[in-house]
């Protein structure tokens, strides 16, 4: 008799794929544009990335460091009107993209939460949650919560408001902290909170260190849903050298939880390559004309247009990973088991019941390595086969779809492999 199928877990929309942050509308759209109407015109691009949610803004009125002139219910006219916002919401809905609104109050000022009048600001946030929920947004983000006194209790209250409206609504909190204990204390009192942090931001050194960080986090958070990013707002290139971007894309898309990216991560957007551009929000490179300041500074392979035409580009990898992440049960909600694969490597299996299983092997080092996969580390339910098919490599040159012998697996410097193999009873 065939074994009984495992019951599928309840899945919220943010469990099904990546979130895409557009913190600066002007930088994202470029060419002196930067409003909600213009963003609506970019929704097809977001659809092509297969992202499930757009984290937008802040876009509310905020006079720098002035509580009285900060109105979370009013859209800054520079970004558009409520009608423009409503139109964006309707269009996003038609494309199955959820809209998450960033309500970080003093986003133009020194302290995101103002240094005084905490209760006044917290009440403003409560009002804004209620107003925008009724206006149709799918969730909220608040950043820099390390600057918010009594953050845990406020987050619990805001979470109650958000979930009280509908269980299908999301609250994201962001912190600059990379300290696991601080992160856990924020998560403790907030069951369904999605937290973005700088926890993984110093993981670029070795595979062992990354493995240790990831497994520690997953063990500490138990069976709660996580999010994966390198920071609450910044680009991957702020933390990673170019050669590790593909590896990290593969990792973020295949860890158990919601991957969260910033606009430009999909093309390796790097402020350092664009003189005069702010580190936190460089202009998005749609094509070679997006950065006219210095002629010739932008080559085609740095842009969305150029990378869209190249199947081997970072953008193409992002699209493929995003597609896999959103349709494979083992990646959507599968169990996770990390195991030893040798120094410099981080490897893990994702599996769900009798569905196709995935093996991820990541070489963080700058030398080629043979993987010594220690299958003995794995539980019986997640045993490794002798061979697995190569779904994709982060490096060119491998024949996709070909079976690889796992005992003889060799990885190039900074290479990541995504392999698939069937369930075997």
């Amino acid at each position: 008799r065939a074994p009984r199928c495992r019951e599928l877990p309840a899945q919220k929309w943010w469990h099904t794929g990546a979130l895409y942050r557009i913190g600066d509308l002007q930088a994202f759209q470029g060419h002196g544009a930067g409003n909600l109407a213009g963003l609506k015109g970019r929704l097809d691009y977001l659809s092509s990335l297969k992202v499930k949610g757009l984290v937008l803004g802040p876009i509310h009125k905020n006079q720098k460091d002035d509580v009285a002139q900060t109105d979370l219910l009013q859209i800054d006219p520079n970004f558009g009107s409520k009608e423009d916002f409503d139109s964006l919401l309707q269009s996003a809905k038609k494309k199955s993209i959820r809209v998450i609104l960033d309500l970080t109050p003093n986003y133009r000022g020194e302290n995101s939460w103002f240094s005084t009048q905490v209760d006044t600001v917290a009440t403003k946030v409560k009002d804004a949650l209620e107003f925008w929920l009724q206006a149709g947004v799918d969730g909220f983000q608040v950043r820099d919560i390390e600057n918010l006194k009594d953050a845990s209790s406020f987050l619990a209250e805001w979470q109650n408001i958000t979930k009280g409206f509908s269980e299908d609504r999301l609250l994201i909190a962001g912190t600059n902290s990379s300290d696991l204990q601080q992160i856990l204390s924020l998560l403790e009192s907030n069951k369904d909170l999605l937290l973005t942090s700088s926890y993984l931001s110093d993981s670029g050194s070795t595979g062992e260190h990354t493995k240790s960080l990831v497994t520690q986090y997953l063990n500490a958070t138990g069976n709660r849903w996580c999010s994966w990013s390198l920071s609450q707002a910044r680009l991957l290139t702020s933390f990673l050298p170019a050669q590790l971007l593909r590896l990290y894309q593969l990792m973020l898309f295949t860890l158990p939880g919601t991957p969260v990216f910033s606009y430009g991560d999909e093309i390796g957007l790097d402020a350092a390559a664009l003189p005069g551009q702010p580190m936190e929000a460089p202009v998005m490179l749609w094509d070679e004309s997006s950065f006219p300041d210095i002629p010739g500074a932008v080559s085609a392979n740095m842009t969305v247009k150029g990378q869209s035409e190249d199947p081997g580009s970072l953008l193409s990898l992002f699209r493929r990973l995003s597609d896999q992440r959103s349709k494979e049960r083992s990646l959507l909600h599968g169990d996770f088991h990390a195991f030893s694969a040798g120094p410099g490597l981080f490897s893990y299996i994702r599996h769900w019941d009798q569905n196709e299983r995935f093996l991820v092997v990541l070489n963080f080092g700058d030398v080629g390595l043979s993987a010594g996969l220690q299958a003995s580390d794995l539980p019986a339910s997640a045993s490794l086969p002798a061979k697995a098919d190569l779904l994709l490599s982060t490096q060119p040159g491998r024949e996709e779809g070909s079976p690889l012998e796992l005992e003889r697996l060799k990885l190039e410097p900074h290479e990541g492999l995504l392999l698939r193999f069937p369930y075997a009873a």
Epitope: D127, A128, F131, Q134, G136, F165, R169
Partner: antibody, heavy 119, light 114 residues
């Protein structure tokens, strides 16, 4: 118990500014929003604006350039100002509490105050 | 702005009989986010302020007699008084409280005893 009481001059000259105060008791203005509504004699209700617990304000766009709502939490008072009034602004003016989360319904109303615009 | 239209303008019903008031909105008042319909009913007796009867189209405010029932969804709504009492003589208003302001009222329906 929850109470709201409107007060202000009953007669205002055309082109002047109408100023009304709503004094509340039995609840805190830092926990609840307050709406202003008006009703011309023998006619229906018109929503003017809402001041939220945190101080944000939604106005009726038809009157937006003329209406100002503010509050003094320490005095438990909300005020309404309507500038450049004409005879068409003659009405009973009500303040009412926004009483429910995820709803703009008004669960408690003041008795209303009649304002006549006439020279 | 959402336009609210009530019918009839006035209604005469015998004591103990059913009174039915209709309200139509120019766009749907259903919020797909929480599946609630953002329509409110008020009762205004002569010389008094309005009184909240029903919100979310069908949720009765506490203390409101159960002879008052709200129904409908999308753009068409009904307030039913199952057995009219003398104290129910009043003008009844529907109000949209959906999404963005202004939160507009219907023109009112006057209920009298036949």
């Amino acid at each position: 118990q929850v109470q709201l009481q409107e007060s202000g001059p009953g007669l205002v000259k055309p082109s002047e500014t109408l100023s009304l105060t709503c004094t509340v008791s039995g609840f805190s203005l830092t926990s609840y929003g307050v709406h202003w509504i008006r009703q011309p004699p023998g006619k229906g209700l018109e929503w003017l604006g809402l001041i939220w617990a945190g101080g944000s304000i939604n106005y009726n766009s038809a009157l937006m350039s003329r209406v100002t709502i503010s509050k003094d939490t320490s005095k438990n008072q909300v005020s309404l100002k309507l500038s450049s009034v004409t005879a068409a602004d003659t009405a009973v003016y009500y303040c009412a509490r926004k009483g429910h989360m995820y709803s703009y319904a008004m669960d408690y109303w003041g008795q209303g105050t009649l304002v006549t615009v006439s020279s | 702005d959402i336009v609210m239209t009530q019918s009839p303008d006035s209604l005469a019903v015998s004591l103990g009989e059913r009174a039915t008031i209709n309200c139509k909105s120019s766009q749907s008042l259903l919020n797909s986010g929480n599946q609630k319909t953002y329509l409110t009913w008020y009762q205004q007796k002569p010389g008094q302020p309005p009184k909240l009867l029903i919100y979310w189209a069908s949720t009765r405010e506490s203390g409101v007699p159960d002879r008052f029932t709200g129904s409908g969804s999308g753009t068409e709504f009904t307030l039913t008084i199952s057995s009219l009492q003398a104290e129910d003589v009043a003008v009844y208003y529907c109000q949209n409280d959906y999404s963005y302001p202004p939160w507009t009222f219907g023109q009112g329906t006057k209920v009298e005893i036949k």
